[in-house]
């Protein structure tokens, strides 16, 4: 059991109060993290509380303001970016969100040498993406789906691409599906390390079917939003990668990088680009049937002015038991010889581990091993490799940072974080300065988050960057729920769960149980992190027990568990939630007449299927923005796990795994269905079809739509949503208001 530190020292129970829904909706108990914006080995920038941009030098201990809040405010800047030569800063304002990562903004360039904004040849607006070159102060930006280059901020721009068209051709930025399901970025352009070359992707969406939905707004007629969105089995974007010499871009023009023959023979995806040197680049490609990935290392041939990708530098990664990679195919981290690299992929035992590839994947040297998984490679230096894993004490929901000395033989491994603040901190990420001279550790829990600065050679803590003192004080008189992370062993499957228990939990009493589920492939819900959220409130104030269970299909516990759901989504994820509920009932403190389940997105799909499982376990449940049929969801995501919805592939399971097919089974449960009408991700269509099937089956249910809201149901909708769901659950559990 993890006792939150705020409760340990307070014996005066009568001064304590439970969490309220208002606390949660107001974000009263939110925490802060500190990620340095590194600009060298020993310097970083940080935006102070009063909005000055301050440069800190760790070695001298000095700090000074490089950009005042007055300058920031003069253009209403909400973000900034310093040029590597430190002569200019871009200021970002008029932020306008598009999809998950993408947004447009207005950019102003401020000249630090004369303390004035650059006048003449100003940037157009709104810009879709803008970035400095890694050296000097060249600018690349995307405007109206075309890429432009400025040699200096005050120079006129050079237009690199001319074919960009809204919803048709995207240059330097991803289309919807690449942004959400493949790149997970707002950009699709990459500078070479010294800024000599600029690589970019072109996405051609001309033949992609379009999803159209109404945006009601305030006008007399609603607008129609049109997004090229390939659903499972539909025509996909066509991607090409180009590289242009930024010194004399008008000469050779952009050069297309060839696609490996074994990839180009059928539909394929580009998955990532990694620059190795100014004249060597690594591209990763993936077959549409996502069990084969090819990593291709390409070299610039000065004499030919072209990029050569020899077959000898193609490395194939193939999965025979599932899809390639975890959620995404991992990216390589190159070593100093600029040809060998480190990469995470499955070992022979089916656990994701770090491998060192010098010539071929077949001859890869395994760097980590064990019945746990390496999760991220943070940095490779001449003598050290820093990575995170969930090895420590065999808790898959933890993250610790490790250092492997690669300069010595045999390599030695050290856990940097395992014993730093053992009770408070079990889930870390890290941010490294150049050459890993220094690094910041950000601990997310299970105690109150804390960010610290460390020496990259000795690992010594230099200072605390953020310890959330105000939060700690605010929580002193709050009755927080207790949390425990344990596991169930069922039929050779390990089901890790997190249970959130009311503050005065008594094992001899009976409590209503709420299952919170996500359950998507390669996800993890049972994590040792701090959170004061809606379910904390439900436990603290309403006396519910909340449980989260990681079943088959979830991540970081080996391929057997992960790939169990391959080609059959909606089966084992649901079974495992049900199995866990039965085990919880056996524990003796659950009121089996008051069990509910809720989930959002993939979790909405799983909760719907669990409610319609016919087990009689659940009295009620909520699905927020659920997928209802895999034929309605994005090709890149869906086909990764389900194959194609064709007769000769997996159409049968596509049809069998819909929520609509189980409409009759909702008759004996209370079901609340919720969706935003402007959901670009899981389209409102999904809930519309569930509702239609329930009506056709004459099954009563409750529903709520949120007009013009997307998949996140943000702003005032959030308050309404959680208030509405609270009422629904309290009614279901016969709890008085």
């Amino acid at each position: 059991i993890v006792l939150r530190p705020s409760r340990v020292h307070n014996s005066e129970e009568n001064t304590m109060r439970a969490l309220t829904l208002k606390d949660i909706l107001n974000g009263t108990f939110s925490y802060k993290t500190f990620f340095p914006n590194w600009i060298s080995g020993q310097e970083y920038l940080h935006q102070s509380a009063d909005n000055n941009i301050v440069l800190y030098n760790i070695e001298t201990g000095q700090s000074y303001t490089i950009l005042s809040n007055r300058t920031m405010k003069s253009v209403n800047a909400s973000n900034y970016g310093l040029s590597p030569d430190r002569q200019f800063v871009y200021l970002e304002s008029d932020y306008s969100k598009l999809w998950r990562y993408s947004y447009t903004a207005t950019y102003y360039i401020y000249d630090l040498s004369n303390g004035e904004f650059v006048r003449g040849n100003e940037l157009p607006r709104p810009i879709q993406y803008l970035c400095w070159s890694p050296v000097g102060s060249k600018l690349a930006y995307v405007y109206q789906n075309n890429i432009y280059l400025k040699q200096r901020p005050g120079d006129p721009p050079f237009q690199i691409t001319f074919n960009g068209r809204e919803n048709k051709i995207f240059n330097g930025i991803p289309d919807w599906v690449y942004e959400e399901e493949m790149l997970a970025t707002k950009y699709a352009l990459w500078w070479s390390p010294n800024g000599k070359f600029l690589a970019y992707a072109e996405f051609n969406d001309t033949d992609i079917p379009v999803i159209a939905y109404s945006y009601y707004g305030d006008e007399q007629y609603p607008r129609t939003i049109n997004i090229p969105y390939p659903k499972a089995g539909a025509k996909n974007p066509v991607v090409r990668i180009f590289i242009i010499d930024t010194t004399y871009p008008a000469y050779v023009g952009p050069q297309e990088v060839p696609v490996p023959a074994m990839i180009a023979s059928s539909d394929y995806y580009f998955s990532w680009l990694t620059w190795v040197t100014d004249e060597r680049v690594c591209l990763q490609w993936l077959k549409r049937v996502q069990n084969v990935s090819v990593l291709s290392i390409c070299d610039f041939r000065e004499d030919w002015q072209t990029w050569d990708c020899p077959k000898t530098q193609e490395h194939i990664e193939e999965s025979r038991t599932g899809w390639a990679g975890g959620f995404f195919v991992s990216t390589p981290v190159f070593s100093y010889d600029a040809i060998s690299y480190y990469k995470i992929f499955s070992d022979k035992d089916g656990y994701k581990h770090i491998h060192y590839i010098k010539d071929t994947v077949e001859n890869a040297i395994q760097i980590t091993s064990g019945k746990w998984e390496a999760i991220n490679i943070f940095r490779v230096t001449q003598d050290s490799l820093f990575y995170s894993s969930n090895e420590f004490e065999e808790y898959p929901g933890r993250r610790n940072i490790y250092r492997i000395s690669i300069g010595s033989y045999p390599p030695s491994k050290k856990c940097v974080t395992c014993h730093l603040r053992k009770e408070r901190c079990q889930y870390y990420t890290a941010s490294f300065s150049d050459y890993a001279k220094y690094y910041a550790l950000v601990c997310y829990g299970p105690g109150i988050p804390i960010s610290t600065l460390h020496d990259g050679r000795t690992d010594q803590e230099i200072k605390i960057l953020e310890e959330n003192k105000e939060l700690e004080n605010a929580l002193k008189n709050i009755q927080l729920p207790k949390e425990e992370i344990k596991k169930l062993e069922v039929d050779e499957i390990t089901l890790w769960y997190k249970m959130i228990l009311p503050p005065q939990f008594d094992r001899s009493k009976k409590y209503p149980l709420l299952i919170q589920v996500y359950g998507g492939p390669c996800s993890q819900s049972v994590r040792s992190v701090f959170a004061v959220n809606w379910i904390s409130y439900l436990a603290s104030k309403e006396g519910m027990v909340i449980a989260l269970v990681d079943g088959r299909g979830t991540a970081f516990q080996g391929d057997k568990l992960l790939y169990a759901v391959y080609r059959k989504l909606g089966v084992y994820e649901v079974e495992d939630q049900i199995t866990a509920v039965r085990k919880f009932i056996e524990m003796g403190f659950i009121d089996e007449k008051r069990i509910a389940i809720w989930g959002w997105s993939y979790g909405g799909y799983v909760s719907s299927l669990a409610l319609a499982s016919g087990t009689g376990l659940f009295k009620c449940g909520i699905a927020v923005a659920p997928v209802s049929s895999w034929e309605y969801y994005a090709s890149v995501y869906t086909e990764r796990f389900m194959g194609l919805p064709t007769k000769d592939d997996n159409l049968e399971h596509y049809k069998n795994s819909t929520v609509m097919a189980r409409a009759e089974y909702f008759r004996n449960v209370d079901y609340l269905l919720i969706h935003g009408t402007a959901d670009d991700n899981v389209h409102f269509q999904n809930s519309a079809q569930i509702a239609k099937a329930l009506v056709n089956a004459q099954v009563d249910f409750q529903a709520m739509w949120y007009s013009d809201q997307n998949h996140g149901l943000s702003g005032l909708s959030t308050n309404h949503l959680y208030t509405h769901m609270t009422h629904f659950l309290k009614q279901c559990f016969s709890l008085s208001d």
Epitope: D155, A250, V252
Partner: antibody, heavy 116, light 108 residues
């Protein structure tokens, strides 16, 4: 050494068509952007069209819709298909290595005369 | 489009003299996109300068380029007999790329 050799010029009536060719050698033709630049008798230079190594085409407004640039990388040859020719298209047509500038190699040129 | 205006139209000089040719753009041109060419009668143009100031391969060092923004200059420090020709500046900043009308350097 790099060589560019134009051919296909000649006398043509207004409204007529002509196809110019440019045979390239001495460099990796398939990886270079190529352009056509013309020079009317006694006048200056005028860029006409360009094509990327990957095939994207660019045109001057004066020829857009009438001229088509293309390339055959297997034959190391650049083409300019000229339709609906006008008297003002009369010029020496040069093929040049480059996209929008730094034209480092030029052919000797081929004369196109549009006259009735 | 960007209009490039060269001056003077004709420059009459003797071998050994210094030639200064001017090129003015109707709008700002980044140095990276400004080139100079030499053309002799009956011949194709020859690339002299790229990026406003960098000599192309094989160009003698008596040719130099300078300038930025809208004003660029080509200088021939000591005219050789083979330098008498027409010189064109050219911008590749925007499509269409354009050439100046040319400056003729003739023997005085």
């Amino acid at each position: 050494q790099v060589q560019l050799l134009e051919s296909g010029g000649g006398l043509v009536q207004p409204g007529g068509s002509l196809r110019l060719s440019c045979a390239a050698s001495g460099f990796t033709f398939s990886s270079h952007a190529m352009s056509w630049v013309r020079q009317a008798p006694g006048k200056g230079l005028e860029w006409v069209s360009a094509i990327w190594a990957s095939g994207e085409q660019y045109y001057a407004d004066s020829v857009k819709g009438r001229f088509t640039i293309s390339r055959d990388n297997s034959k190391n040859t650049l083409y300019l298909q000229m339709n609906s020719l006008r008297a003002e298209d009369t010029a020496v047509y040069y093929c040049a290595k480059g996209w929008l500038g730094n034209f480092d190699y030029w052919g000797q040129g081929t004369l196109v005369t549009v006259s009735s | 489009e960007i209009v490039l205006t060269q001056s003077p139209g004709t420059l009459s000089l003797s071998p050994g003299e210094r030639a200064t040719l001017s090129c003015r753009a109707s709008q700002s041109v980044s140095r990276s996109y400004l080139a100079w060419y030499q053309q002799k009668p009956g011949q194709a143009p020859r690339l002299l300068i790229i990026g406003a100031s960098t000599r192309a391969t094989g160009i003698p060092d008596r040719f130099s380029g300078s300038g930025s923004g809208t004003d660029f200059t080509l200088t021939i420090s000591r005219l050789e007999p083979e330098d008498f020709a027409v010189y064109y500046c050219q911008q590749g900043q925007v499509i269409p790329p354009t050439f100046g009308q040319g400056t003729k350097v003739e023997i005085k």
